[in-house]
């Protein structure tokens, strides 16, 4: 038994036929010693007398609000809730399995940007006697603060004969660092109480993995002279992180008729405009995704093809960001070839995802380690890799990136990747390895030496351990190169001489 909140207790029960249940001793919160009686819920039947009451809790009939009285006066209450465990698994009767992105997904969370603000939601078919409370932190062994509001009913839907209720909650990390590479996941815990049943649900994620931008805004069409083509332009959504030269998006533009199976024109672009072929009765739609990390695409923003009269000059804003006059090269050190680094780091992002596209859908944190791999270098908050830090002195950040590149380059050339089980022949790990080396050499020309971090002895003994470690390293590398790519894109846009 444990205390959920003041005067509310949770009894954990193994739930099987003829289970002995749990012996629970309730103590009346009073200085009185004599003449105390106990009742349950609205019943006037006296269950026992004395300052303590011992009960055997086996089923829901034994749970409820126990009250101690003296001479018709209520002294205190103790509410007992049951938490069922069947075959070693805690019950999940209150919430509905959303089955996306995998089975046993009860909580789903999304973030519109990297500010540390996120929303979680869950579904239930229960309409009454239901309460939720939400707690969150970053990390669990030394938790950092995340503040969550109250869960509220956000939608009601009819599903066949049933009604489905969606609840949601908004949370904000207390000291968010949008530009850093996360190393500890956010933990979200939801306590659910339906009548006398208690259940708890948890989710663990990095903000980068739950990013889903809002749709692009201000779609505009401009028909091109003497052509069936239309120039479509748009802007970054207002809710996306700034500056856009650092937090860049990529876009998918699609022209399609009303039917999902209709023929379509489709083009991908990093710009905020594109030229497409518009058809009668078709719509132009644009959606956005983080340019350097394969999180979710936004929902589509759409305009009908027929409305292509609202022409306007320009092609939207927000694409290159940075604006204004170019900043001088970094003080206190030679400036890297920003544009070359940008191109190579973007290639690294592509390679890191093609090296393990499915890694994104595997929950590698189930292995009991709090971070992906404890020993890999992360680009942290104090490393100066944020836009302001780069402007002040980019050398700190570049040194950190260089250390990480050397580290990962050594890891990818180590026994972890060369040993059994052999990599598939078509694995891009070889290309990834070469590109890491290429970028690190661009960052550290001859005669300029930064100290590099020691490679820990990560060599696992079993092939399955090696396979798991590969996944974790590649997953971590995806996050690392995404931050590096943002740094170089921003540098190319604002720091290039």
């Amino acid at each position: 038994i444990w205390e959920l909140k003041k005067d509310v207790y949770v009894v954990e029960l193994d739930w099987y036929p003829d289970a002995p249940g749990e012996m629970v001793v309730l103590t009346c919160d009073t200085p009185e010693e004599d003449g105390i009686t106990w009742t349950l819920d609205q019943s006037s039947e006296v269950l026992g007398s004395g300052k303590t009451l011992t009960i055997q809790v086996k089923e829901f009939g034994d749970a409820g609000q126990y009250t101690c009285h003296k001479g018709g006066e209520v002294l205190s209450h103790s509410l007992l809730l049951l938490h069922k465990k069947e075959d070693g698994i805690w019950s999940t009767d209150i919430l509905k399995d959303q089955k996306e992105p995998k089975n046993k997904t009860f909580l789903r969370c999304e973030a519109k940007n990297y500010s540390g603000r996120f929303t979680c939601w869950w579904l239930t078919t229960i309409s009454t006697d239901l309460t939720f409370s939400v707690k969150s932190s970053r990390g669990s062994s030394d938790p950092q603060g995340v503040t969550c509001g109250a869960a509220t009913l956000s939608a009601e839907r009819v599903r066949g004969d049933n009604k489905e209720y969606e609840y949601s909650v908004e949370c904000q990390e207390d000291s968010a660092c949008p530009a850093a590479e996360e190393s500890l996941p956010i933990e979200v815990m939801v306590d659910a109480v339906h009548k006398l049943k208690y259940e708890n649900y948890t989710s663990s994620f990095f903000i980068r993995d739950i990013i889903k931008p809002d749709p692009p805004k201000n779609l505009q069409l401009k028909p091109l002279k003497n052509s069936r083509q239309v120039e479509v332009s748009w802007e970054y959504p207002d809710t996306w992180s700034t500056p856009h030269s650092y937090f860049s998006l990529t876009f998918c533009v699609q022209v399609q008729g009303k039917s999902k199976r209709a023929k379509k024109d489709r083009v991908f672009t990093d710009k905020t405009s594109a030229t497409v072929i518009c058809r009668k009765n078709a719509s132009i739609s644009v959606r956005a995704q983080d340019r350097y990390y394969s999180s979710s695409w936004s929902e589509w923003a759409s305009v009908p093809c027929s409305g292509s009269g609202s022409s306007r000059g320009g092609s939207g804003s927000g694409g290159s960001g940075g604006g204004g006059s170019k900043l001088r090269a970094v003080p206190g050190g030679s400036s890297p070839a920003w544009t070359q680094c940008q191109q190579l780091s973007q290639k690294l992002c592509t390679l890191a995802w093609s090296a393990h596209p499915l890694v994104g859908h595997m929950d590698l944190r189930e292995e009991g380690d709090e971070e992906t791999t404890n020993d890999v270098p992360h680009i942290q908050c104090g490393d100066g890799c944020d836009p302001q830090g780069l402007r002040d002195n980019s050398q700190f950040c570049l040194q950190r990136i260089h250390q990480g590149l050397i580290f990962y380059e050594k890891l990818l050339g180590s026994d972890i990747f060369t040993g059994e089980p052999s990599l598939l022949p078509d694995s891009p790990v070889g290309q990834l390895h070469a590109s890491l080396l290429g970028l690190s050499q661009l960052l550290q020309p001859e005669g300029h030496h930064w100290e590099t971090q020691q490679i820990p002895s990560l060599s696992p003994s079993q092939p399955w351990q090696r396979l798991l470690l590969r996944f974790k390293i590649l997953r971590s590398l995806q996050a690392f190169v995404a931050v590096a790519a943002r740094v170089f894109a921003h540098g190319a846009a604002t720091l290039s001489p």
């Epitope: 023929k263 379509k264 024109d265 672009t269 030229t275 072929i277 592509t350 093609s354």
Partner: antibody, heavy 118, light 107 residues
Framework: QVQLVQSGAEVKKPGASVKVSCKAS????????LHWVRQAPGQGLEWMGW????????EYAPKFQGRVTMTTDTSTSTAYMELRSLRSDDTAVYYC???????????WGQGTMVTVSS | EIVMTQSPATLSVSPGERATLSCRAS??????LHWYQQKPGQAPRLLIY???QSISGIPARFSGSGSGTEFTLTISSLQSEDFAVYYC?????????FGGGTKVEIK
């Protein structure tokens, strides 16, 4: 399955015109875009243009603008590509291809060899 | 128009070896790039679309990567039926253009 069958080989004199046909089957004709791509002997591929059989919309590569006409006959599920003012460097295999996506080529015809020679 | 450049023009590889084909665009084309295989006397066949998306029915040994201006088609372990000419094609803007092709021949 989706299939495209093209007309037979042609030999033409310089200055003449040629009309190649492409009969589609295995799908609803108006549901796919149709493109024409050519390949000169021993050379690479060259895109000529596309037609939308649903409405007759066309887009031609600038190189062929004014010399090529693409049409369709929905009653027979057939597409046509006419190239006028033929020159010897128009000697090539002409392919039609179909796709639900406008910008790449999924299903190809077997090709029609057009020889331009005096 | 966007010019696509493929290298090498000819690649000599032994069966079972890995082949890496390159395609470069004259300007950034995001991931609007597609790969085709053509055997002598046959029409081309689509292998990969949008830089890395695989086609059902195409063996898993064919994979694509890249974005922006540089793209790669990798054939992990060449089979006898893979000796052919490979073309890349950009779909970023009209006119659609192809690379000059890379001939993969038996070493």
């Amino acid at each position: 399955q989706v299939q495209l069958v093209q007309s037979g080989a042609e030999v033409k004199k310089p200055g003449a015109s040629v009309k190649v046909s492409c009969k589609a089957s295995g799908y609803t004709f108006t549901d796919y875009y149709l493109h024409w791509v050519r390949q000169a002997p021993g050379q690479g591929l060259e895109w000529m243009g596309w037609i939308d059989p649903e409405n007759g919309d066309t887009e031609y590569a600038p190189k062929f603008q004014g010399r090529v006409t693409m049409t369709t006959d929905t009653s027979t599920s057939t597409a046509y590509m006419e190239l006028r003012s033929l020159r010897s460097d128009d000697t090539a295999v002409y392919y039609c291809n179909a796709n639900k996506e406008l910008r790449y080529f999924d299903v190809w015809g077997q090709g029609t060899m057009v020889t331009v020679s005096s | 128009e966007i010019v696509m450049t493929q290298s090498p023009a000819t690649l000599s590889v032994s069966p079972g070896e890995r082949a890496t084909l390159s395609c470069r665009a004259s300007q950034s084309i995001s991931i609007n790039l597609h790969w085709y295989q053509q055997k002598p006397g046959q029409a081309p066949r689509l292998l990969i679309y949008f830089a890395s998306q695989s086609i059902s029915g195409i063996p898993a040994r064919f994979s694509g990567s890249g974005s922006g201006t540089e793209f790669t088609l990798t054939i992990s372990s060449l089979q006898s039926e893979d000796f052919a000419v490979y073309y890349c094609q950009q779909s970023n803007s009209f006119p659609l253009t192809f690379g000059g092709g890379t001939k993969v021949e038996i070493k």
